[in-house]
């Protein structure tokens, strides 16, 4: 896929900032509000921000230029750049009335057919787990074998770096094809197929992405706060896996949530399935020694592993990957359109 | 196991509120739907709301919107509901419910129940 | 809203016949569908999920079937404690609904 433009977004932050910059005013409210960031620490939802006045004026004057509003896209070019600019002008439009946090990125509803050639599997025994074929698929798929092998390499040995393992596991779900990447990682195994839900749980190289000892999950979300690419994809994660009814619908559509949690691989909110028998899925942390905020620790690690919202979208797609191969195809290439919510 | 324990029986007058709590033990509160169900004497069942504590998520049925209340106390464990302006129709037994979701297949049953709490409402 | 239509509203049986309780649902509802148990003065007890699942403990006499608007609850040899009111319930959308309930009374 090409990446998309800055033009192709309805309102670019980088592009924000460009107009900004030619308008003195706004251009000095701008580098105000961006010198207050170490006066103003970023708040946890428990937190209140203090604010200095000249930090509040900077703000206000802020709020009526095309930066509030502005916004970015996961695979653009310039995205760290784009979110840098995103969250500086957060701060104006949450200062002194503290609001939760917007996921910075813009939807763009691709339904670009996925390409597929099955007749090529026929070199797999016919009763291989469809994880296997589904990693056979990516095989097959030259830009998606060659990342596939450079987050391998990257994340495999004894001494294995994890900063670099995760930055390789971001680029591979950032850049491979959807299908490609969800197929990957959302295959479906046979409830006793111990082998296939394992081949599942390492997809993501477990032993070199995750941290070896599991650190508190607020300490985990502090340092994700930190950079402003893992928060935005644990902001945007957190608005589209939302539950909006106790069934389980959420709040926008399931494809939009299962983007946003295959956008969190490879930040430090590295999320993974946690056994070899079931699609339940975890982070990689522990609520124990949270003290007296047990409660938001427990809310944050929930929104993981006791979400029906994302638990129903897995599970559907798993389903959706399933019926591919269950299905007599007319020709061996066939296009599957992305698929679409059950909500 | 999650079990749960409603509140005594209630006698109130026509006009006044009830408040019926349910207090849960044997799992993580907080991670649970519970949905509130009534049955009138002789009656079918009948969903009220629910309530996801953990996402703050709850879901009114229409005829109960603007009626209902539903609550939850994590500290307790202790899921409420509470039902304004009644009228004699209230007369019911009102159960409390996890509604189980995470199941990763066709999702959300009610298991377990609470034993129920019997509302009598007198003119 | 979505409707659920059970029949029969009742029905008696004897010790060892094999019962069918139907439900219908006035729209497609997947497999999303449920079966309750409730003795008088009881709550009601979960026998069957998503159509054709059986909750753990319960006997394998009862098997649920069915899938869209046709669900179907048997009960392959009746036995006295199987005497009761039994609620289909569809979990596909909000509000969530039951059916009006079929009572299983002694022949």
């Known amino acids: 896929d090409p990446l998309p433009t800055e033009s192709r977004l309805m309102n670019s932050c980088l592009q924000a900032r460009r107009k900004c910059q030619a308008d003195p005013t706004c251009s000095a409210a701008y580098h105000h509000l961006d010198s207050c960031t170490s006066s103003i620490s970023t708040p946890l939802p428990s937190e209140e921000p203090s604010v200095p006045a000249d930090c509040l004026e900077a703000a206000q004057q802020l709020r009526n230029s095309s930066l509030i509003g502005c916004m970015c896209h996961r695979r653009m070019k310039n995205q760290v750049a784009c979110l840098d600019i995103y969250w500086t002008v957060h701060r104006a439009r949450s200062l002194g009335n503290y609001e939760l946090d917007v996921s910075p990125y813009e939807d763009t509803v691709t339904s670009k057919p996925w390409k597929m050639n099955l007749s090529k599997l026929n070199m797999l025994k016919p009763d291989s787990d469809l994880c296997l074929k589904f990693a056979m698929l990516c095989t097959l798929n030259d830009k998606c074998d060659r990342l596939r092998k450079a987050y391998g390499e990257a994340c495999s040995g004894p001494h294995c770096q994890r900063h670099v393992c995760l930055r390789q596991l971001l680029t591979f779900f950032e850049k491979a094809a959807e299908p490609h990447a969800q197929g990957l990682l959302l295959c479906p195994c046979a409830p006793n197929d111990r082998g296939c839900g394992e081949r599942r749980r390492n997809t993501i190289a477990p032993n070199c992405a995750l941290p070896p000892v599991a650190p508190n999950c607020l300490e985990l979300r502090r340092l994700c706060f930190s950079d402003p690419l893992c928060r935005s994809r644990l902001v945007d994660f957190q608005t589209h896996c939302h539950p909006m009814d106790i069934l389980g619908t959420c709040a926008t559509e399931q494809s939009r949530c299962l983007r946003a949690y295959l956008g969190l691989i490879g930040t430090a909110m590295t999320p993974n399935f946690v056994s070899n028998v079931n699609t339940s899925v975890a982070l990689s942390c522990t609520c124990r020694g949270s003290g007296n905020l047990q409660e938001e620790c427990e809310m944050l690690e929930g929104f993981f592993s006791h979400n029906p919202c994302l638990t129903e979208a897995i599970a559907a797609k798993m389903r959706f990957h399933s019926q591919l191969f269950s299905q007599d195809w007319p020709h061996p290439t066939f296009a599957v359109m992305a698929h679409q919510n059950e909500n | 196991e999650v079990q749960l324990v409603e509140s005594g029986a209630e006698v109130k007058k026509s006009g006044s509120s009830v408040k019926v709590s349910c207090k849960a033990s044997?799992?993580?509160?907080?991670?649970?739907?519970i949905s509130w169900v009534r049955q009138a004497p002789g009656q079918g069942l009948e969903w009220m709301g629910g309530?996801?504590?953990?996402?703050?998520?709850?879901n009114y049925a229409q005829k109960f919107q603007g009626r209902v209340t539903l609550t939850t106390d994590e500290s307790t464990s202790t899921a409420y509901m509470e039902l304004s302006s009644l009228r004699s129709e209230d007369t019911a037994v009102y159960y409390c419910a996890v509604f189980y979701y995470g199941s990763g297949s066709y999702r959300n049953w009610f298991d377990p129940w609470g034993q129920g709490t019997l509302v009598t409402v007198s003119s | 809203d979505i409707q659920m239509t059970q029949s029969p509203s009742s029905l008696s049986a004897s010790v060892g016949d094999r019962v069918t309780i139907t439900c219908r649902a006035s729209q497609s509802i997947s497999s999303y569908l449920n079966w309750y148990q409730q003795k008088p003065g009881k709550a009601p007890k979960l026998l069957i999920y998503a159509a054709s699942s059986l909750q753990s403990g319960v006997p394998s006499r009862f098997s649920g079937s069915g899938s869209g608007t046709d669900f179907t609850l048997t009960i392959s040899s009746l036995q006295p404690e199987d005497f009761a009111t039994y609620h289909c319930?569809?979990?596909?959308?909000?509000?969530?609904?039951f059916g009006q309930g079929t009572r299983l009374e002694i022949k």
């Open positions: 319930q569809q979990s596909y959308s909000i509000p969530i609904t």
């Open positions: 044997g799992g993580t509160f907080s991670r649970y739907a």
């Open positions: 309530i996801i504590p953990l996402f703050g998520t709850l």
